[in-house]
Structures are given as structure tokens and as C-alpha cells.
Amino acid sequence: SEVEYRAEVGQNAYLPCFYTPAAPGNLVPVCWGKGACPVFECGNVVLRTDERDVNYWTSRYWLNGDFRKGDVSLTIENVTLADSGIYCCRIQIPGIMNDEKFNLKLVIKPAKVTPAPTRQRDFTAAFPRMLTTRGHGPAETQTLGSLPDINLTQISTLANELRDSRLANDLRDSGATIR
């Protein structure tokens, strides 16, 4: 069964996918498609890499990670409800039936309705509601609800919690393997 990832309408979604290049000069082609991985290739391709670079992409889909080092995680900009569904990351390893296939389920939640802005609400700009880690567990994307009106003590506490949180750290390492 596919791992589930969540994002909110209007935010960027992050779908992790990694592999370890076998040889520095010759990367493994990767395709991303909308829909579960078929027997071959990717259906409804949204992005593709070849032995050196990104050679096909569609609007809003891009690789933000070190894709030449094997981080082929997909970023989808400014998601809408229509972006919900299964996505396929296919590592196209040479040879018959050698491909690594990963199905990832993206769940898009409606944007939260926020009350009329107050001066204290300016604080939320410093802490966007979607905090993304590029870790290796199943919960790479976590969503914070709308922040209520809070006092300065609460702001300080929340800031410290965010600073200390693992959400604030990039857990990805250069030796990541396919998962």
C-alpha cells in the first residue's frame, strides 16, 4: 500500500523519493507520473530525468533536492484539490524488470478559513502553516492548524518549540538509499 502525504490547498506538496547513483557520471533515469506505477514507464508523466538532468517537466512540478545525488523527490507548487491522488516515482534501473517503483498518495486538504487579520496575526507569516522535513520516515509533511490569537509568552514558547523541533531540521543525508 502507498504511503500517504498531505498538503493544504495553496501550499507546496513534497513527495519523497531517493536512490543511490551507481556511478557518478551516469545517473539512473527517473520518471514521475500521476497514477499508480504501471508495468513499464510512468503513466501521465509530469517530470522525467535522464542520465544527467531534468529533460521533461510540466508546469508546477520540479525537483528541489540534490537530484544528481539521488534525491529525486517531487515538489508540486501551489496545489489544488485536483492534485490529490496516487503518484508514481519510478527509478529506471537498466535491465529487464529492474525498475524500483514507489506509489505515493497525496491528500490535499482545503485551505483553512482564517478570521479577519489582527495585528498579532502578523506573527503567522514567520511560521507558515506547512512545515516540511525531508526525512526518511513516512511523515515528511506535517501541517499546523491556523494559529490562534496568542500572547507574547505563547509566541516565545512556540518559537522555542519550533526551533527545537525536528521539523526545523533537514534530516536528509547524502547517502540516502531507495525507499
Epitope: 557518478p24 557520471g25 551516469n26 542520465e51 544527467r52 538532468d53 531534468v54 529533460n55 517537466w57 520540479w62 525537483l63 528541489n64 533536492g65 540534490d66 537530484f67 544528481r68 515538489t75 507548487e77
Partner: antibody, heavy 120, light 107 residues
Framework: QVQLQQSGPELVKPGDSVKMSCKAS????????MDWVKQSHGKSLEWIGY????????SYNQKFKGKATLTVDKSSSTAYMELHSLTSEDSAVYYC?????????????WGQGTTLTVSS | DIVMTQSPDSLAVSLGERVTINCKAS??????VAWYQQKPGQSPKLLIY???NRYTGVPDRFSGSGSGTDFTLTISSLQAEDVAVYYC?????????FGQGTKLEIK
């Protein structure tokens, strides 16, 4: 140390072809891509294409398809670029540059450039 | 093709002053941007790769930052030998494209 030694200046007539070379030394030639870049006089840089000496694989800027042909001779660690059907627009300095995996395929070493003048 | 637009086209700065050169990509290129320095009559030299990594032997007054579409090359304290044209380049997707160049002079 790594060096890319390019062939000397060329003066050719319109319609002719020219083949310039880039001899690599100081590293394993087949482990790195070789890219070619054009710089017209007083202008910016234009990527022409690359070749991967390990397997001869190439990729070209659409603008230079049919204009440039990239080849390598692994035995002499030399990359070549042939330019066809030359016009005055092809007059420029042409650089070979090593595309390094460890620098994310930015160009860590460049040749000194070959100046091509197309004139009747 | 991805268009890389540098600003300014040229600038004159006093020795010891801070220099900032900007580069904007027409679409996101992740961190796949390099900066090169080209002095008159010379080949370009790599300064910064992968947006913020200083290449071997490059003085630490040079630094790069940015990701996505907006990138910056900074020289913290301008030296006389920094007079050159500076180019950004995206190597996210072919055709790899360069900015138009920024000419840096001493005021």
C-alpha cells in the same frame, strides 16, 4: 593538474566546415562529461552540447543541432567539435569545459578557447 | 528554454565595498546554479556551484545564495583583482543557459 588544451585559431570561408579539438590531461577522461560553450564577441555564453566520453552519449542545444557534431577519441583523451555550413554568425570563441559530477555538472575546468573567424 | 536574467548589467563599486549581483530564473531550477568570473582575454572560472558552494581555491569573500528562481552572488569586500564579468548559469535542464553577464568595475 587538470588541463584542457584547445587547438589554435581558425580562419575559414563561409560554407566550409571546421573541426576543433580539446585535449584533456590530469584526470580520467571517461569519468567526466565534456561540454562545449560558444562566446560571440562581447556577448554572453551559449551552451552548445555535451558528450560523455565513457559511452559517447551526446546532448545538444536544439539551436546547434545540425550545426555542431561532438565526438571523442578515448585513446588520446581528446574531445572534438565539428561545425558545419559556417556563416559569419559562427565567428566566436569556442570553449570546451569539463562538467563535474561533484560540482553538479557546473564547469570546473575550461580550455583556453579556440577563436573561429568565418570570412570570405 | 529557461531564461536567466542578471541585474544589474554593470556596476562600479569602490574598493573594500560590498558587491551584490542578482540572477533570476524564468522558472524554478532548485539549487542548480553556478557563478563564473571571466576576466578580459581569459576563460571563465568557476566561483560558486550548486548555488552556494564555493569552489576550491576561491577566496572566501565570494559567496552565493538562493534557490528556486532567485540567486545572489556577493563579494563581501571588493578587491582590484575582482574586476571582471560575472555570469550565472542554470544546469537544471538542458539547454543549460547563462545570464547575460554583469560587468564589475572599480569606482
Amino acid at each position: 593538474q587538470v588541463q584542457l588544451q584547445q587547438s589554435g585559431p581558425e580562419l575559414v570561408k563561409p560554407g566550409d566546415s571546421v573541426k576543433m579539438s580539446c585535449k584533456a590531461s590530469g584526470y580520467t577522461f571517461t569519468d567526466y562529461y565534456m561540454d562545449w560553450v560558444k562566446q560571440s564577441h562581447g556577448k554572453s555564453l551559449e551552451w552548445i552540447g555535451y558528450i560523455y566520453p565513457n559511452n559517447g552519449g551526446t546532448s545538444y542545444n536544439q539551436k546547434f543541432k545540425g550545426k555542431a557534431t561532438l565526438t571523442v577519441d578515448k585513446s588520446s583523451s581528446t574531445a572534438y567539435m565539428e561545425l558545419h555550413s559556417l556563416t559569419s554568425e559562427d565567428s566566436a570563441v569556442y570553449y570546451c569545459a569539463r562538467g563535474g559530477y561533484y560540482s553538479y555538472y557546473s564547469y570546473d575546468y575550461w580550455g583556453q578557447g579556440t577563436t573561429l573567424t568565418v570570412s570570405s | 528554454d529557461i531564461v536567466m536574467t542578471q541585474s544589474p548589467d554593470s556596476l562600479a563599486v569602490s574598493l573594500g565595498e560590498r558587491v551584490t549581483i542578482n540572477c533570476k530564473a524564468s522558472q524554478s531550477v532548485g539549487n542548480n546554479v553556478a557563478w563564473y568570473q571571466q576576466k578580459p582575454g581569459q576563460s571563465p572560472k568557476l566561483l560558486i556551484y550548486y548555488a552556494s558552494n564555493r569552489y576550491t581555491g576561491v577566496p572566501d569573500r565570494f559567496s552565493g545564495s538562493g534557490s528556486g528562481t532567485d540567486f545572489t552572488l556577493t563579494i563581501s569586500s571588493l578587491q582590484a583583482e575582482d574586476v571582471a564579468v560575472y555570469y550565472c548559469q542554470q544546469h537544471y535542464s538542458s539547454p543549460y543557459t547563462f545570464g547575460q553577464g554583469t560587468k564589475l568595475e572599480i569606482k
